[in-house]
């Protein structure tokens, strides 16, 4: 019996469409596959950052595959051919791998790249990052924000900066259709006629840096002699009920009595007769059901009773 | 509840000066651009400019270039334009309005401070 | 400076029917792939009501029978079907670059 072998891919390789991290990788059908017409032949495709401890593999009969890279680091991929062992009436055979890198070349030293850079989406609604400028840059350094994510048909330049001193150092974005749930991407990169300046890539999925407005419309409510209901409403704008966790700051009598954790609009609290105030705050954040991470919104304005009769039905500021 | 405070009126003589005062509350006060805009009566709305409190950015329309001065207090969330040369010209409403970025308009308005000018 | 001219200066129309603004600007307001268009609302002695930005979203809590189309230096508001609580001055105002202006305002009033 002769050995049955394949060819890797032809052709492997990284292509960049300007959508700052989003790449394709992409080959051609390996050489000489005459013999197994019949074949539905597979690749196993093996791609990376370098600097990254583990591969992402993954087996398709596709000539091309998309994902997400860290612009700032290279990457590099490997490929190879698999015939199913249908195809070879015994066991799989797996060609060589062929082999690819892409990166872009770094200009300027890290030091002249952005620093701190903080991206907030507010409400769900209005995202706006901040930078400060690269150490020991000139004033007539000046740097660009564009961002990409998919449905849009290519990457956009900040519409409204942020500017201190004549520098940009930050983006009020315009509305972003479409644009949670899935990988945004960010390219910040400047000028400077006296130096070449380095850029910087950034990834993130909008749902997990919300920081939502906070509660509103704070009750009192009259349970029973011992107990009493805070209650408050959703911050307004478009987040769901379902999307919220809260924390709570009750004060009673001027002494922290409880911070709480809850997932809906109420607090039952125990109390005694001789409580002469009481206070709460509220904060709501975007919990796990909708977002992987998020950002506590501002404490409520503070809503409190104070008097003889905490008995009375309803305490409504 | 996004709320933008500003007095009813002001009286002002001929040739003086006056600043008009827009308290913001309900919402981070750095975040978004305050604009300042002029309405006589029966007349069209009149942009005069407007001032970014995150860093004190400020664009004017030239019309009102040496009019009007913006400026912010972002301790007190106040927005200040002050207006110099008074002349019964400048006897209008003027609204401050929040907005976030060109792109979204301008959607918080206050109730707007009517200025007479007369001796 | 960019120059709005809105029509016609008013309008009546009858209620449950459609009403129809025009604004045209003197040079395109589209960048970025966007239309810095945006429509208000002014009734007497109030302040102007954000009704669409961008040409064709809608502000925060207004009506859907509100709704703005266009992009260049053509543009229109559509109010259907037409309610009393419409009866207003309604002004176009682009805000693609320093200074924003704003169109010279369509009364539209009940038929």
């Known amino acids: 019996d002769t050995e049955i072998k394949v060819n890797p891919p032809q052709d492997f390789e990284i292509v960049d469409p300007g959508y700052l991290g989003y790449l394709y990788l992409q080959w051609q059908p390996p050489l000489s596959l005459d013999h197994f017409k019949e074949c539905t032949v597979e690749y196993e495709l093996k791609y990376r950052n370098i600097g990254s401890e583990t591969w992402k593999t993954i087996i398709t009969k596709n000539l091309h595959y998309k994902d997400g890279f860290d612009l700032n680091k290279g990457i590099e991929a490997k490929i190879h051919t698999l015939l199913p062992w249908q195809c070879t009436n015994g066991s799989e055979v797996q060609s060589s791998w062929a082999e690819t890198t892409y990166w872009i070349s770094p200009q300027g030293i890290p030091e002249t790249k952005v620093q701190d850079m903080d991206c907030v989406y507010y409400n769900w609604q209005y995202l706006l990052c901040s930078w400060k400028p690269g150490i020991g840059v000139l004033l007539d350094t000046n740097y660009n924000l564009f961002y990409w994510y998919e449905g849009l048909d290519h990457a956009l330049q900040c519409v409204d900066y942020i500017k201190a001193d004549g520098q940009n150092i930050g983006c009020r974005f315009p509305y972003l259709e479409a644009s949670d749930y899935k990988d945004f991407y960010i390219c910040v990169n400047g000028s400077s006629e006296n130096k070449p300046i380095r850029s910087s890539y950034f990834t993130f999925q909008l749902q997990n840096i919300v920081k939502p407005l906070p509660p509103v419309y704070l009750t009192f409510t009259r349970e029973s002699s011992c107990e009493i209901k805070l209650k408050w409403s959703i911050p307004l704008g478009p987040i769901p009920a379902r999307c919220f966790d809260y924390e709570i700051e009750i004060r009673e009598d001027d002494t922290t009595l409880v911070t709480a954790t809850v997932e809906n609009e109420t607090y039952t609290l125990k109390t005694t007769n001789e409580t002469r105030q009481l206070c709460f705050v509220v904060r709501s954040k975007v919990n796990i059901a909708c977002s992987d991470d998020g950002i506590w919104s501002e404490w409520s304005d503070k809503q409190c009773w104070e008097g003889e009769d905490l008995s009375k039905k309803t305490l409504l500021r | 509840q996004v709320q933008l405070q500003q007095p009813g009126a002001e009286l002002v003589r001929p040739g003086a000066s006056v600043k008009l005062s827009c308290k913001a509350s309900?919402?981070?006060?750095?975040?978004?651009?305050m604009n300042w805009v002029k309405q006589r009566p029966e007349q069209d709305l009149d942009w005069i400019g407007r001032i970014d409190p995150y860093d004190g950015d400020i664009d004017y329309n030239q019309n009102f270039k040496d009019k009007a001065i913006l400026t912010v207090d972002k301790s007190s969330s106040t927005a200040y334009m002050q207006l110099s040369s008074l002349t019964s010209e400048d006897s209008a409403v003027y609204y401050c309005?929040?907005?976030?970025?060109?792109?979204?308009?301008?959607?918080?308005w206050g109730q707007g401070t009517s200025v007479t000018v007369s001796s | 400076d960019i120059v709005l001219t809105q029509s016609p200066a008013s309008l009546a129309v009858s209620l449950g029917q459609r009403a129809t603004i025009s604004c045209r600007a003197s040079e395109s307001v589209d960048n970025y792939g966007i239309s810095f268009m945006n429509w208000f609302q002014q009734k007497p002695g109030q302040p102007p009501k954000l009704l669409i930005y961008a040409a064709s979203r809608q502000g925060s809590g207004v009506p859907a029978r509100f709704s703005g189309s266009g992009s260049g230096t053509d543009f229109s508001l559509n109010i259907h079907p037409m309610e009393e609580d419409d009866t207003a001055m309604y002004f176009c105002q682009q805000s693609k670059e320093v200074p924003w202006t704003f169109g010279g305002g369509t009364k539209l009033e009940i038929k």
């Open positions: 309900g919402y981070t006060f750095s975040n978004y651009l």
């Open positions: 309005a929040r907005g976030y970025g060109t792109a979204y308009g301008v959607d918080y």
